[in-house]
């Protein structure tokens, strides 16, 4: 490590050509963890380029990534999950650029699934529920969820609600009547683990009922 440039500008210049980013997924396949890396520049010629991770591993010094089209991938049980790993882009055994990364700070959860919305006529509300595989996991169990919904005709006017549970109630009075809504949800690690938003769940579509006022009844 002692051979690295100490000047900040030189340091970043060294990374420019082969800048890459990575995310980890813990217990993504049983007790196996995964690490996925890709170059920031999609035009990088990846022929002969390899990725390797060294340090903060169990029983081995280094592991090589598999290449799957334009991404580089490892699935293993051998992440120590404490301390920093050195992830390097290599060509012919020579390192072109490296990053020290703590795998617990680049966690990307799996996308939530089974999103559904049920209208409760008596309560005049919509109960939003969804599921996450992380309820069964032993490491990244605590997540923050971002539920986003919009009226289908308002292309970029998303409303967001952050919550830690997998159930949300939307009041009918806060939604437009007789409108089609799209809703989706994603997750990010909370409590110790850090990282990135998951992919969005598949969208769910629901229609709000018309306002049905009885004679003499006030608008809600």
């Amino acid at each position: 490590e002692s051979g690295y440039a100490q000047n900040g500008d030189l340091e970043d210049a060294e990374l420019d050509d082969y800048s890459f980013s990575c995310y980890s997924q813990l217990e993504v396949n049983g007790s196996q963890h995964s690490l996925t890396c890709a170059f920031e520049d999609p035009d990088v010629n990846t022929t002969n380029l390899e990725f390797e991770i060294c340090g903060a591993l169990v029983e081995v010094k280094c592991l090589s990534f598999r290449k799957l089209q334009e991404i580089y991938f490892i699935e293993t049980k051998k992440f120590l999950l404490i301390g920093k790993s050195n992830i390097c882009v290599k060509v012919g055994g020579k390192s072109l650029t490296c990053k020290k990364i703590d795998l617990t700070t680049i966690v990307k959860p799996e996308a939530p699934f089974d999103l559904s919305v049920i209208y409760r006529e008596g309560a005049n509300d919509f109960v939003v529920t969804f599921n996450t595989s992380h309820l069964q996991k032993k490491y990244v169990k605590v997540l923050m969820h971002d539920v986003a919904y919009r009226q289908e005709k308002d292309e970029n006017k998303w409303m967001h609600v952050n919550l830690s549970s997998t159930k949300l109630t939307l009041l009918q009075r806060n939604l437009q009547p007789e409108a089609m809504y799209e809703i989706k949800v994603r997750s990010i690690p909370d409590h110790y683990f850090k990282g990135f938003w998951s992919e969005w769940s598949p969208s769910y579509y629901f229609r709000t009922p018309e306002i049905n006022n009885s004679p003499g009844e006030m608008d809600p």
């Epitope: 490590e1 340091e11 020290k100």
Partner: antibody
Amino acid sequence: QVQLVQSGAEVKKPGASVKVSCKASGYRFTDYELHWVKQAPGQGLEWIGGIDPKTGGTAYNQKFKGKVTLTSDRSTSTVYMELSSLRSEDTAVYYCARSGGRWYFDVWGQGTTVTVSS
Amino acid sequence: DIVLTQSPASLAVSPGQRATITCRTSESVSIHLLHLMHWYQQKPGQPPKLLIYGASNLESGVPARFSGSGSETDFTLTINPVEAEDTANYYCQQSIKDPYTFGGGTKVEIK
């Protein structure tokens, strides 16, 4: 080899400020967060806060917020801890320490003694 | 804040014997098999030195007579066999939750 070298001892009057430096060498400065730990005379260790030299992002022990400001200078691979409104209870040895992981400290500076006395 | 309680506060051990220090936390510092407990040695006039990280991982360059174990709220540092140069204060530290707190220390003396 990996080293953290801190500035020399300081004697300050109550109400004054002091800025302690910690110069890193032997590794790429932006690869590791640097933290500060207080040790009052005859006492144990107390985490003050840390800084990520790559981003300048800081984390502080709530107890030291308003008392301590952490900064870093990538051009000289140096981090700084400024203590303000000094009081006698700030008399201590202050250590900078590199975080080898979240958040344990694998390399320590030699310590800087700050004495607050009228 | 998570409180770390070390015991004993001090102990005297003969060379070649085993020294055991315990650290109990006010709440769990483990996430499954990830145990966020670390141990340091501090000799008079010197900065602390990392011995064990993640409850049981020996820091590079630290003699194998130092070992760590434990999970959740109960952790142990063992020195076996103790040598004269092990006279020092020993501290545990948790890193699951900010602020990252240390135990009060255990003073180990060699008889």
